[in-house]
């Protein structure tokens, strides 16, 4: 199971990196286009990965003004990078009953980023609890 647990660790590192990136972007909310974006909240169990992909697909945009433009766009690019695959992620990809991205309430960038962080924290918590209980599924 060594390679499996290494994959899990890579996944955890990536999710924590994503939280850092979200926190970084929150510093620049005034430099983001004030567009309303689908922002999943209170995501039902087993739909976390579906909601995660909604956050990644959202068209978060820099206002392209001032000297923060490059930092913001690099951070947005980092947010969209695919995380290492996990068994739970693979399983959830086959689930067809999760809400579509458009069905989620739309929020401005500040709340969008807060909700994204909240989902990432939930996914990390689930991941840790599943490992504590001896499962390597999530």
């Amino acid at each position: 199971h060594k390679s499996s647990s290494q994959g899990q660790d890579r996944h955890m590192i990536r999710m924590r990196q994503l939280i850092d990136i979200v926190d970084q972007l929150k510093n620049y909310v005034n430099d983001l286009v004030p567009e309303f974006l689908p922002a999943p909240e209170d995501v039902e169990t087993n739909c976390e990965w579906s909601a995660f992909s909604c956050f990644q697909k959202a068209q978060l945009k820099s206002a392209n003004t001032g000297n923060n433009e490059r930092i913001i766009n690099v951070s947005i690019k980092k947010l969209k990078r695919k995380p290492p695959s996990t068994n739970a992620g693979r399983r959830q990809k086959h689930r067809l009953t999760c809400p579509s991205c458009d069905s989620y309430e739309k929020k401005p960038p500040k709340e969008f980023l807060e909700r994204f962080k909240s989902l990432l924290q939930k996914m990390i918590h689930q991941h840790l609890s599943s490992r504590t209980h001896g499962s390597e599924d999530s």
Partner: antibody
Framework: EVQLVESGGGLVQPGGSLRLSCAAS????????MDWVRQAPGKGLEWVAE??????????YYAESVKGRFTISRDDSKNSLYLQMNSLKTEDTAVYYC??????????WGQGTLVTVSS | DIVLTQTPLSLSVTPGQPASISCRAS??????????MHWYLQKPGQPPQLLIY???NLESGVPDRFSGSGSGTDFTLKISRVEAEDVGVYYC?????????FGQGTKLEIK
């Protein structure tokens, strides 16, 4: 393995034009931010131009020294990056490197192609 | 434009001894805890290779005798024990904003 291979360099007279190409492989080119960086003989590195990914709508950016004369472009279907250089000056003489800007820093570089502008 | 000034412009080091290169920016390249400064080594006849990104992060595959530090306007690249293969020109580069600029380079040679 990531590979970037430049071509199109050569000798050109002042005022002339040249088109550089860069063939990319080993990574998802359409997602990449690509840049040209040049190095005059015996000198340091100078950033020339950048083109971002399809997801960013391919915006382009230029150093002041080449603005209005050089055009960076890409063809994602061919995994290729280009630099069209017009109104060339002697000070444009340099090795031109094709590079991938991967989040923080130029991670991958080609071997470079030499452009000589001389009469 | 942010101007990067490297010192010294050249240094000669005995193998096994440490080396240090400084890079000073004309304005801060740090913001909200991140420092947008990177270091490269260009070996003779080769393109540059990334050594350190975001001031202190070692690029994958780079020996851990290389380290970076600093924030704001002052940055340092250190080599704990110089080896023969470390010869070449070292450049700092910022990505705080466009245009991206490089330092003028520091040539390292072996005594």
């Amino acid at each position: 393995e990531v590979q970037l291979v430049e071509s199109g360099g050569g000798l050109v007279q002042p005022g002339g034009s040249l088109r550089l190409s860069c063939a990319a492989s080993g990574f998802t080119f359409s997602d990449a931010w690509m840049d040209w960086v040049r190095q005059a003989p015996g000198k340091g590195l100078e950033w020339v131009a950048e083109i971002r990914s399809e997801a960013d709508n391919h915006p382009t950016y230029y150093a002041e020294s080449v603005k209005g004369r050089f055009t960076i472009s890409r063809d994602d279907s061919k995994n290729s990056l280009y630099l069209q250089m017009n109104s060339l000056k002697t000070e444009d003489t340099a090795v031109y490197y094709c590079t991938e800007y991967d989040y923080e820093g130029f991670v991958h570089w080609g071997q470079g192609t030499l452009v000589t502008v001389s009469s | 434009d942010i101007v990067l000034t490297q010192t010294p412009l050249s240094l000669s080091v005995t193998p096994g001894q440490p080396a240090s290169i400084s890079c000073r920016a004309s304005k801060s390249v740090s913001t909200y805890g991140y420092s947008y400064m990177h270091w490269y080594l260009q070996k003779p006849g080769q393109p540059p290779q990334l050594l350190i990104y975001l001031a202190s992060n070692l690029e994958s595959g780079v020996p851990d005798r290389f380290s970076g530090s600093g924030s704001g306007t002052d940055f340092t690249l250190k080599i704990s024990r110089v080896e023969a293969e470390d010869v070449g020109v070292y450049y700092c580069q910022h990505s705080r904003e466009l245009p991206l600029t490089f330092g003028q380079g520091t040539k390292l040679e072996i005594k």
